[in-house]
Interface confidence: low
């Protein structure tokens, strides 16, 4: 069995959680309710998963199959840059950084925007197929 | 729903300042920025700056950046501009706007203040 | 500084014709653009973000479209009530610009 970091790759384990959505190797979680940027990170972490770090282009397009024209927050934040919550830059997209209050990432089906991280929109977590279940 | 609402026309004379205020209700001030657009009679629109009511910051388009000074006042949920060194150039319409959730366009304006500069 | 060209300033068309407005960029604005109505002595209403995302409240017979440098808004069957100037904003920069304004009246 794997484990250690959310951010790794995850092994191919055969279900997700209660109202998880099971998506190639990972777990997906689209809330019904709206939060706060921040509150939704706390609402992640604590089901042992993290607010939605993309990967690639591929994977983008495949959750936005599931995404409507309503926002939901992902774990990506302007510091000095754009960055995903494990640290890593934005560079498979584009999203607009040319305000003092849009400092953080949403998704829909169109596409990454930047939004006032005190807006309550939904939110997307990700994380491994049973919990703590990463792949080194 | 948001609500802007501008002070009332002034006539000023060439050199002196004034300082137009923009009152929102209806939402928390401090999540998104104001943005003031200026409209001269028969043109178009001009971004002046915006400040980010939570902290204050500024930014202001270079051709305004020695003419406006944009402040805040938390308390009573008020923007305001003041332009300095007047000149019949000055007049115009301005415009407070809120700054829309996905970017910097603007999808809540006030009524518009009416600047008349003239000796 | 992006510079935003609408090619015409004045438009004529017949009540239940279709408008289309153009706007320009002078730079790829991957579709961080909006469209304002403004009717004389009012303040600019927010029609259109994201190039072709419809406000709440705005009737459908307006749409946006385009990409890159080039956009557009179609009225597609034209009321009384939208004798108006439009006018487009790119936010893909700062700053925000507008285009100079395309005032549709009727034929």
């Known amino acids: 069995l794997c484990q250690g970091s959310n951010y790794s790759t995850c092994a191919s384990c055969p279900s997700c959680p209660d109202r998880w959505m099971k998506y190639g190797n990972h777990c997906y979680y689209f809330s019904v309710e709206e939060k706060d940027w921040n509150s939704s990170l706390e609402f992640c972490l604590a089901r042992d998963s993290h607010l939605l770090v993309i990967t690639d282009n591929q994977e983008m397009s495949l959750l936005q199959v599931f995404l409507s024209e309503a926002f939901c927050w992902i774990g990506l934040r302007n510091n000095s840059g754009w960055r995903w919550e494990d640290g890593s830059p934005l560079n498979f997209s584009r999203i607009s950084s040319n305000s003092f209050v849009q400092t953080c990432g949403a998704i829909n089906k169109n596409g990454l925007q930047a939004s006032s991280c005190e807006v309550p929109l939904h939110w997307v977590c990700k994380k491994c197929p049973f919990a703590d279940q990463a792949l080194f | 729903q948001v609500h802007l609402q501008q002070s009332g026309p002034e006539l000023v004379k060439p050199g002196a300042s004034v300082k137009l205020s923009c009152k929102a209700s209806?939402?928390?001030?401090?999540?998104?920025?104001i943005t003031w657009v200026k409209q001269r009679p028969g043109q178009g629109l001009e971004w002046i700056g915006w400040?980010?009511?939570?902290?204050?910051?500024?930014q202001n388009s270079e051709k305004f950046k020695d003419k406006a000074t944009l402040t805040v006042d938390t308390s009573s949920t008020t923007a305001y501009m003041e332009l300095h060194s007047l000149t019949s150039e000055d007049s115009a319409v301005y415009f407070c706007a809120r700054r829309g959730q996905f970017g910097p366009y603007f999808d809540h304006w006030g009524q518009g203040s009416t600047l008349t500069v003239s000796s | 500084v992006i510079q935003m060209t609408q090619s015409s300033s004045f438009l004529s068309a017949s009540l239940g014709g279709r408008v289309s407005i153009t706007c320009r960029a002078s730079d790829h604005i991957y579709n961080w653009l909006a469209w304002y109505q403004q009717k004389p002595g009012n303040a600019p209403r927010l029609l259109i973000s994201g190039a072709t995302s419809l406000e709440t409240g705005i009737p459908s017979r307006f749409s946006g479209g385009g990409s890159g440098k080039d956009y557009t808004l179609t009225i597609i069957s034209l009321q009384t009530e939208d004798i108006a100037s439009y006018y487009c904003q790119q936010y893909w920069n700062t700053p925000p610009t507008f285009g100079g304004g395309t005032k549709v009246e009727i034929k």
């Open positions: 209806g939402d928390t001030f401090t999540t998104y920025d």
């Open positions: 400040i980010y009511p939570k902290d204050g910051r500024t």
